[in-house]
């Protein structure tokens, strides 16, 4: 889980001939806002279909009244981030559009009137946790210029947020094979229970023993690069080893087209493909209308008799979006309980309840520990619909069934031998270093003739502390 | 990467007391083990009082009943509260560490304790 950030820096009017009218009027007052919809992987999508990813609006604007005889200058613009929460991994790979709608605050009957302004989309590769991402866009004659970033929520780390960190449980170290969490060593990564072997760059899991592939890998262990054309492709050997090449450098690669469009290449040069309301050798020209249809999923069209005067979109019963697009998601209120899965199911909502669990909504707390026992003393603890024994000293695993190895963690320091003992281990150190982990080298100088050790870090052990 | 910064050297009287600072940073002093360690004019640095990053403590035989080492998790600081000094216990004082997650150690600049009359 995670959230996806968007910090519109400035919409006027792009570089060149041609400056747009501004949108605003000393006779019709005018706001703006954004709205940004995201939408998983690079393939290509129907303006159409759902934001899968998410979508956010903005707050308003200032109010901006258009000083009569200047040029359209950039607009005022709302505070603050657009964030769109993720529920599940980040898929590297994502398609955005970006909106910029008016909100007149003329004496119009009914309130004030919305119409779209600008709309970009494009493609983009984005680690999560990386830094903030800089981009312009060019709608028509208006500019639009945006940061972005991905970043995870606690407990999840990692490019694609699917690494957990978890408050360490022993207070020196982490647990055999597991890492410290950074900047500081008071969490550690959770167990990782993917399938074995599952590349941790490009796969990841939500449920023990599996492995899916995040955007652009495949094969069952998410190592193989999926190529964007096929292994044929004149720019890109095949490998047996890797599957197929990423094709060289050609005239689509970066997609010159704008706003969604798709390229195709041609014989001397590429061709675009528009969406819906945008027109122009890169799509970069945009008047969308009522009678381009924007409105999705039975949705009304107001007004937009010509590019000049936009549109507005009546939605009906569970759809919601300025294009309609977005089902509207019941499951969002998340009504289910202790973690239950929320269904839609459209006529009603169902909620699947984790084990431990149950009731309509997952309300009912079901006794854990009832009929289970812990093996060699020790105790059933509750707690998320799963049965845990914390075990006594020596013993490990789901029931304590299990002698745990004290010195399977390499407890002793600077090359000390462990030793398991009935009351947990012993360390004995190696010459030079003393103490009860042979944590504290004795004369840390050795044979240097050097009055004093510079300060600053001196490799110990420097092998990962596993 | 740890940093260690003492402080609270300085020349005392034979017999008197001094307390060094150890402030951490980069990790918490509840997951490192840290050290104190002495250095005379012409001599080899040397252990002088540990703890454990579980909380156990241990001194040289010359120190014992004499020096204290104690850790402040919310301060992040280790200290040493040294009393009835003697001539010899003038040396540089260091700040030591050992990270457990990176199996690293780290030292300090180090801080001056002269006793004389």
């Known amino acids: 889980a995670g959230v996806f950030e968007l910090q519109i820096h400035s919409f006027g009017p792009g570089p060149g001939p041609g400056a747009p009218r501004s949108p605003c009027s000393a006779r019709l007052p005018c706001r703006l806002f954004f709205r940004v919809c995201l939408k998983p992987g690079l393939s290509e999508e129907a303006a159409e279909s759902p934001c899968a990813l998410g979508a956010a609006l903005s707050a308003r604007g200032p109010v901006y009244t258009e000083q009569p005889g200047a040029p359209a200058p950039d607009l005022p613009l709302p505070d603050g981030l657009l964030q769109v929460p993720f529920r599940d991994a980040w898929p590297g790979t994502f398609s955005f559009i970006i909106e910029t709608w008016r909100e007149e605050l003329g004496d119009q009957i009914g309130g004030p009137a919305w119409s779209l302004l600008a709309r970009v989309a494009g493609r983009r590769r984005l680690a999560a946790g990386g830094p903030w991402a800089r981009d312009i866009q060019r709608a028509g004659a208006w500019e639009l210029r945006f940061s972005y970033r991905a970043r995870c929520e606690p407990p999840a780390v990692g490019t694609a947020c699917t690494r957990l960190c978890r408050p360490r449980s022993a207070p020196s170290r982490c647990g055999p094979g597991l890492r410290p969490c950074a900047p500081l060593e008071d969490e550690c990564e959770a167990p990782l229970v993917c399938r074995a072997g599952c590349s941790p760059e490009h796969g990841f899991c939500e449920q023990p023993g599996e492995c899916r592939c995040l955007e652009g890998w495949t094969g069952p262990l998410c190592t193989v690069p999926v190529s964007t054309s096929s292994c044929l492709s004149p720019r890109g050997p095949s490998s047996a080893t890797t599957g197929c090449l990423v094709p060289g450098p050609g005239p689509c690669d970066g997609n010159p087209c704008a706003n969604g469009g798709s390229c195709s290449e041609t014989p001397r040069s590429f061709e675009c493909t528009c969406p819906r309301g945008f027109y122009g050798l890169r799509c970069e020209v945009s008047g969308v209308t009522c009678a381009d249809g924007p409105c999705f999923n039975g949705g009304l069209c107001v007004g937009g008799a010509d590019p000049d005067s936009a549109y507005i979109c009546h939605c009906p019963p569970g759809f919601q979006g300025s294009n309609c697009e977005k089902r509207v998601d019941r499951c969002s209120l998340q009504p289910c309980r202790n973690g239950g899965l929320c269904l839609d199911l459209g006529h009603a909502l169902r909620c699947r309840c984790r084990a431990g669990f149950a009731g309509p909504r997952c309300e009912h707390d079901l006794d854990d520990c009832a009929g289970r026992a812990c093996a060699n003393g020790g105790t059933c603890v509750e707690g998320g619909g799963a049965h845990r024994c914390s075990c006594a000293l020596g013993f490990g695993g789901r029931d304590c069934r299990e002698r745990a190895d004290p010195c399977a963690a390499r407890p002793c320091a600077h090359g000390g031998r462990c030793y398991a003992h009935f009351s947990g281990l012993v360390c004995a150190c190696a010459p030079g270093y003393m103490g009860a982990r042979c944590e504290f080298p004795v004369h840390p100088d050795g044979a240097s003739a050097l009055p004093a050790a510079p300060p600053g870090l001196r490799p110990g052990d420097p092998q990962r502390y596993l | 990467e740890v940093q260690l910064v003492e402080s609270g050297g300085g020349l005392v009287q034979p017999g008197g007391s001094l307390t060094l600072s150890c402030a951490a940073s980069?990790?918490?002093?509840?997951?490192?083990?840290m050290a104190w360690y002495r250095q005379a004019p012409g001599k080899k640095r040397e252990l002088v009082a540990g703890i454990s990053a579980d909380g156990s403590t241990g001194y040289i035989d010359s120190v014992k009943g004499r020096f204290t080492i104690s850790r402040d998790n919310a301060k992040n600081s280790v200290y040493l509260q040294m009393n009835s000094l003697r001539a010899e216990d003038t040396a540089v004082y260091y700040c030591y560490a050992y990270r457990w997650a990176t199996r690293y150690t780290y030292w300090g600049q180090g801080t001056l304790v002269t006793v004389s009359s």
């Open positions: 980069g990790s918490r002093v509840s997951f490192l083990s």
